[in-house]
Amino acid sequence: VPRWRQQWSGPGTTKRFPETVLARCVKYTEIHPEMRHVDCQSVWDAFKGAFISKHPCNITEEDYQPLMKLGTQTVPCNKILLWSRIKDLAHQFTQVQRDMFTLEDTLLGYLADDLTWCGEFNTSKINYQSCPDWRKDCSNNPVSVFWKTVSRRFAEAACDVVHVMLNGSRSKIFDKNSTFGSVEVHNLQPEKVQTLEAWVIHGGREDSRDLCQDPTIKELESIISKRNIQFSCKNIYRPDKFLQCVKNPEDSSCTSEI
């Protein structure tokens, strides 16, 4: 008789999750020689240990501490790019501007990017059928707690000028409920961070509005200012041209506003 299994509202663990994490770890340590000391077997054991045999609605940041310790990484604190609801462009940018880093350019972010995972209470099984949905089931699920933990640490490490890429096509350009709005904004350290500079990415080709005047951007400015961090904002009217100019800054067309 098959054992009763909790049905959650979200998709189950990504197929081949352990193999994918391991392969990504090996690949990352190959590309980043400064992380060659990392033992990928220990990383997988720590990752697994954070959620296996635990109730997937009762995961804590403490559960991920062994993994956080193994994945400790120094990135240039003044080269951090945060993003909200515009991941692909942020990643395209750091692939070109190699000295800047998103969270997914760090080992732990790279390992977990686009993956889902959860276990079951009191069994060593990985649940490939379903995992808790943040809204419909619970917020303290393995995936949400992981990203909250790594996002907090990433924001805490930032210094000088921190950049954030925001999606100007969304109704809430700045969303207080996003990871950026609920975690990263509140964990920037005023004694280290001088300025948060927002880049608002326009979606429409003929969109010439100043989205830096959007009410949600003003809300972000207010939150940041209250934390004694300066705020600045730029419109990126042509994201395609923006990327092209990052690749070829000497191009004559790159002197005009993008």
Partner: antibody, heavy 120, light 108 residues
Framework: KVQLQESGPGLVKPSQTLSLTCAVS??????????WSWIRQHPGKGLEWIGY???????YYNPSLKSRVTISVDTSKNQFSLKLSSVTAADTAVYYC????????????WGQGTLVTVSS | QSVLTQPPSVSVSPGQTASITCSGD??????VCWYQQRPGQSPVLIMY???KRPSGIPDRFSGSNSGNTATLTISGTQTMDEADYYC???????????FGGGTQLTVL
């Protein structure tokens, strides 16, 4: 065509360390994209995966053997090695080296295997 | 005792279809590979990523994998297919790659 060749002593005394080397020809270990693995087969029995190494030095071992296994790589000689410590008669087997893809399990090139007997 | 279970032996008449199964918990959520091993020889990869054949492997070999069972199917079986067949996949409980116990295919 990639070829793998195992070498090492065919007889090891109990409690000693078994040491084998796999020489790779027809392709470079350093080219990346592959795991270099050790697999063994007890006489008349099935196959058992021991572990792998990537050219960068990253390793992954069968958890049941991890405490006794060390796999190392020498890219300058285009070879990788296996050390299995504290051997017993239960470690008597044909030892194969093989090349596998990064999702593991798909070993497309194998050595011909070398029989290692553990006996005093 | 392997966590991937294969029947110890399968018999088939020449020209018939042989099916060799490999079962394990959540097997369909991991890639399965299959190997053919003739007596005194090294194993040969005949199927990877569930359904893909390496170059040089005849198209009479096919594979499938869903739920808890993977299957290697040999259609139009020939006497030269007589060998031991092993499946291999990642096992979550062991956190490593595991081979099935092997199936001896006899072509009668």
């Amino acid at each position: 065509k990639v070829q793998l060749q195992e070498s090492g002593p065919g007889l090891v005394k109990p409690s000693q360390t078994l040491s084998l080397t796999c020489a790779v020809s027809g392709g470079s270990i350093s080219s990346g994209g592959y795991y270099w693995s050790w697999i063994r087969q007890h006489p008349g029995k099935g196959l058992e995966w021991i572990g792998y190494i990537y050219y960068s030095g990253s390793t992954y071992y069968n958890p049941s053997l991890k405490s006794r296994v060390t796999i190392s790589v020498d890219t300058s000689k285009n070879q990788f090695s296996l050390k299995l410590s504290s051997v017993t008669a239960a470690d008597t087997a044909v030892y194969y080296c093989a090349r596998g893809g990064v999702m593991g399990g798909d070993f497309d090139y194998w050595g011909q295997g070398t029989l290692v007997t553990v006996s005093s | 005792q392997s966590v991937l279970t294969q029947p110890p032996s399968v018999s088939v008449s020449p020209g018939q279809t042989a099916s060799i199964t490999c079962s394990g918990d959540n097997l369909g959520d991991h890639y399965v590979c299959w190997y053919q091993q003739r007596p005194g020889q090294s194993p040969v990869l005949i199927m990877y990523e569930d359904t893909k054949r390496p170059s040089g492997i005849p198209d009479r070999f096919s594979g499938s994998n869903s739920g808890n069972t993977a299957t290697l199917t040999i259609s139009g079986t020939q006497t030269m297919d007589e060998a031991d067949y092993y499946c291999v996949a990642w096992d979550d409980s062991l956190s490593g790659w595991v081979f099935g116990g092997g199936t001896q295919l006899t072509v009668l």
